[in-house]
């Protein structure tokens, strides 16, 4: 009979054992276990009846169709063959063992004790057949196996072969290399590769096959495993296998597909193709007069591109345009985009205006091209080139004048200060005191007349100021504040302000040039109550043009002792003139005590710690700050006064030899104007040079060596 | 000719603000200062301060410095004064000027709870 | 602040008759830079707003009649009124507006 045994593990027992077994009997227990497991069979007692071959009494094991081994007897002999210590192992999941014995036993027998179990396959190790093993790595697990494949790859849908992505491959560039993935080790198996060439219509693609080509092949059949096939629109070339290489493809396409088809065996390197675009060629070019063609090359194919430029000092002209470099391309018709254009010497064309200044060339034709030269110079003596440059330029290749030191910027004509046209007399006798002025003995005075219109009815008043540069003047605050409220400061608007300059006689006021203002600055600190920090600026409307009797004032170096005590100074203005006016006098005569003719005066600079005594013994709350300084003389008899207000005290320079503004007329009182002892307050402009620069918007290095010169 | 003209009289509790409007006509709003001055009943007149339209540019007295506030409408030529935390002794005629000459008609304030 | 004191505080005066007012400052209010004197004086009847008379301590305000007249500088004005008026009963202030504008208490002019 047969037995059906499913289990892991079991004990196979000969009939009645362990008493003998009885004649003339048979069994067969079918063992069968999961797939990826074998069967273990092994022995612990055997003892049957002896024969030759086994005729008689056997244990036969075996599979569907393999007899594994046939036992017999109680000892191995030549004919007969007992299990011992021997086990059995199964090739698959199937293992049949089958007991017999004879009609007749000589001997009691005991018969056998069996035991099986079932033992995991590697079968990792034991797959040969290439058909069945894995591709790239195996993985063995008890009851089965798993493979997987290295980076890059993908497992097949068979679950053992690997195989790349490689259906989205594309080249637009004009020459490029393709190769078998992988190469130059084997290609992967189970693959569909697809390779587009899409270059720019006008390209035409040419193949080359290189080095090694190895594609699996048949000998009988063409290609039936792997294979190239090259695709050129509906023409199909190919395929191709083997160990020869096809020969140059010229496709006379700017687009080509090339598919590559694995198998899912072989062992072969694989392929590599370059490629190349072919375009029509175009005529060979020459360059212009003048220039060169970049690159420069025997033969130029479509899509090729040329860069005309030019010497140095020439410049392309296409079409009556210039430009620095012209670029022109080899079309896939065969014909150039555009002709060659040809090379113009560069020309700088008529050179900037200086404001203030002239022009002079310096060669003949008065010429603007390349190389050509020029010189800048200042209207002299009024203006002077900043830094005392050479004022020398030359047409340079890019198209521009250019100045050693300045490059392309225009030379700056900086008005000259402190230099009147007529020079100050040395002896002045003793405003009030003071002496008419020569006209361009102070060309820097200027008459400031504010109509404050936002009051009703409208205030109006007048002051001096000090010419800084074409466009600003220098004065007090107090002369632009509004009047009317005295504890604040409203600066007036720039609208009620007008500015005199060149004026000689206030009855006369045609040959002076009058100015509107742009901006009226007051010094941020100025203070109402003491007149601390009694500085302003006016910005004119427009730059006023400078001349012999409007020249500006230099400004001081930053100094905070100011000048020094007892130096002399001088200061101008169109103030009363008369010390034995009164103040009531000059109300009930409105503005006739004023001076027609512009008055100047020469004072000495009182010490601080003086002038400081003198306002302290007074009566009132007077302060001389280290923003002040005073002149005058302790006798009285000259001094500056009412209407005076802004305008600027002067002491000669000796090292630039220059007039510089130290002060500014800004009060003193309560005695009238030239009262002994009552000394005139000024403000110390040399606290105040940055703060200027910084307000006109000029750096202070622009006008200091003009200064120090 | 030049013409102020204020808003109407406004009754208000103490603490409360008033806003009280001058509208200019017959000149350059913009260029003139505009005054405000009050008048308690049966009293004196009290400068407040002012405005430049223009500019903006203030001035105040003390007095009311913090309390009152002067505005000015260009596009409509008018000028505003609000006064803040009102009490019973602000209740008075407020006049807007043109610097010194032109008046407007007044607007009574009245503060009471 | 500059305080402004006017006397007398009020005034009979007969018709035709001449009328003086004085108005006194703590400060003077003569800006030196213009040479004005920023004193003005103002008209008011009951129910009506101040009227301009005089600025600039004795200019006359176009339309004022000339029997107003002022005169003055520093810190001493004078408002004079040469013939009383009926027409002319009211209450005149002074305005100082040198510094922040301060006004005199006022002095009440009515007929005797």
């Known amino acids: 009979h047969t037995v059906e045994l499913n289990n892991m593990f079991g004990q196979i027992q000969s009939p009645g054992y362990p008493d003998s077994y009885p004649s003339d009997s048979e069994v067969t227990w079918n063992i069968t276990v999961p797939d990826g497991f074998r069967i273990k069979l092994y022995f612990m007692h055997f003892n049957l009846e002896s024969s030759y071959l086994c005729e008689y009494d056997y244990v036969k094991v075996e599979t569907e169709d393999q007899v594994l081994a046939t036992f017999c007897g109680r000892e191995t002999t030549d004919t007969e063959q007992t299990p011992g210590q021997e086990v059995v192992l199964s090739p698959g999941s199937f293992m049949s063992i089958t007991f017999r014995s004879d009609f007749s036993n000589e001997e009691r027998f005991t018969g056998f004790d069996a035991h099986y179990m079932a033992v995991d396959v590697d079968e990792c190790k034991e797959r040969e057949d290439e058909e069945l093993s894995c591709d790239h790595y195996c993985h063995n697990y008890i009851g089965g196996y798993y493979c997987s494949c290295r980076f890059g790859y993908i497992l097949h849908t068979d679950n053992r072969t690997c195989r790349v992505e490689c259906s989205d491959n594309l080249f637009t560039q004009r020459t490029g290399v393709i190769t078998s993935p992988d190469f130059p080790n084997p290609y992967p198996k189970s693959s569909e590769c697809l390779y587009t060439i899409e270059l720019e219509e006008g390209f035409m693609v040419n193949l080359q096959f290189e080095d090694i080509f190895d594609i699996e092949d048949h000998p009988e059949v063409p290609c039936p495993y792997d294979y190239i096939k090259i695709k050129v629109g509906p023409k199909v070339l190919g395929p191709f296998c083997g160990e020869k290489a096809p020969e140059p493809i010229s496709t006379q396409s700017h687009s080509v597909l090339i598919l590559f088809h694995s198998d899912n065996s072989g062992e072969n390197r694989g392929w590599r193709l370059s490629y190349r675009a072919a375009g029509n060629e175009c005529p060979e070019l020459q360059p212009p007069v003048h220039g060169k063609i970049e690159p420069s090359q025997a033969k130029y194919f479509f899509k090729d591109q040329v860069l005309v430029s030019c010497d140095t000092g020439y410049k392309v002209l296409k079409d009556n345009v210039e430009m620095d470099t012209f670029q022109i391309e080899c079309l896939k018709d065969g014909t150039w985009s555009n002709k060659i254009p040809t090379c113009k010497i560069v020309d700088c064309r008529a050179p900037g205006e200086l404001e203030h200044g002239l022009i002079t060339f310096s060669t003949r034709n008065n010429l603007t091209t390349y190389k050509s030269e020029i010189k800048y110079s200042c209207q002299e003596p009024y203006y002077k080139m900043l830094n005392n440059n050479t004022g020398i330029y030359t047409c340079s290749a890019q198209g521009v004048w250019m100045n050693k030191v300045l490059g392309r910027s225009l030379p700056t004509c900086l008005p000259e200060c402190g230099q009147p046209s007529r020079s100050l007399p040395s002896l002045v006798k003793r405003i009030i005191g003071g002496r008419n002025a020569e006209p361009g003995l102070f060309p820097w005075q200027a008459l400031i007349v504010v109509e404050d219109t936002s009051r009703v009815p409208n205030d109006k008043w007048f002051g001096s100021g000090a010419l800084l540069s074409a466009s600003w003047i220098l004065t007090a605050a107090h002369v632009l504040r509004s009047q009317r409220r005295d504890t604040t400061v409203i600066p007036v608007s720039k609208e009620h302000v007008t500015v005199y300059l060149g004026l000689h006689d206030v009855r006369d006021k045609s040959g002076a040039v009058n100015s509107s203002a742009a901006r009226v600055v007051l010094h941020p600190d100025f203070n109402i109550q003491n007149y601390n920090h009694d500085i302003a600026l006016v910005q004119l409307q427009e730059p006023v043009p400078l001349g012999p009797h409007v020249m500006p004032v230099c400004l001081p170096r930053l100094e905070p002792e100011g000048p020094a005590p007892h130096m002399l100074g001088l200061v101008a203005g169109w103030g009363i003139s008369n010390p034995n006016v009164t103040v009531d006098e000059i109300i009930s005569s409105g503005t006739r005590t004023l001076s027609d003719v512009l008055q100047y005066v020469k004072l000495p600079v009182v010490p601080h710690a003086e002038c400081k005594t003198s306002y302290e013994s007074r009566s009132g709350n007077y302060s001389v700050t280290e923003n002040m300084f005073c002149a005058g003389y302790y006798e009285g008899g000259k001094d500056t006064c009412l209407g005076d207000s802004g305008g600027a005290f002067v002491i000669f320079d000796d090292l630039s030899q220059r007039w510089v503004v130290q002060g500014l007329v800004s009060w003193g009182g309560p005695e009238e104007c030239g009262s002994k002892q009552v000394y005139g307050v000024y403000t110390k402009v040399s606290n105040y040079v940055d703060w200027v620069w910084e307000q006109m918007g000029l750096p202070q290095s622009v006008v200091e060596p003009q200064v120090e010169r | 000719q030049v013409q102020l003209v204020q808003s109407g009289a406004e009754v208000k509790k103490p603490g409360a603000s008033v806003k009280v409007s001058c509208k200019a006509s017959?000149?350059?709003?913009?260029?003139?200062?505009i005054e405000w001055v009050r008048q308690a009943p049966g009293q004196g007149l009290e400068w407040i301060g002012e405005?430049?339209?223009?500019?903006?540019?203030?001035n105040y007295n003390e007095k009311f410095k913090g309390r009152a506030t002067f505005t000015a409408d260009s596009s409509t030529s008018t000028a505003y004064m609000e006064l803040s935390s009102l009490r019973s002794e602000d209740t008075a005629v407020y006049y807007c000027?043109?610097?010194?000459?032109?008046w407007g008609q007044g607007t009574l304030v009245t503060v009471s709870s | 602040d500059i305080v402004m004191t006017q006397s007398p505080d009020s005034l009979a005066v007969s018709l035709g008759e001449r009328a003086t007012i004085n108005c006194k400052s703590s400060?003077?209010?003569?800006?030196?830079?213009?040479?004005?004197?920023?004193l003005a004086w103002y008209q008011q009847k009951p129910g009506q707003p101040p009227k301009l008379l005089i600025y600039?301590?004795?200019t006359r305000e176009s339309g004022v009649p000339d029997r107003f007249s002022g005169s003055g500088s520093g810190t001493d004005f004078t408002l004079t009124i040469s013939s009383l008026q009926a027409e002319d009963v009211a209450v005149y202030y002074c305005?100082?507006?040198?510094?922040?504008?301060?006004f005199g208490q006022g002095t009440k002019v009515e007929i005797k």
């Open positions: 000027l043109r610097s010194e000459d032109v």
């Open positions: 017959g000149y350059t709003f913009t260029g003139k200062w």
């Open positions: 405005i430049l339209p223009g500019t903006g540019s203030t």
């Open positions: 400060q003077s209010l003569l800006q030196s830079r213009t040479r004005k004197n920023y």
């Open positions: 600039w301590a004795s």
């Open positions: 305005k100082q507006s040198y510094n922040i504008p301060t």
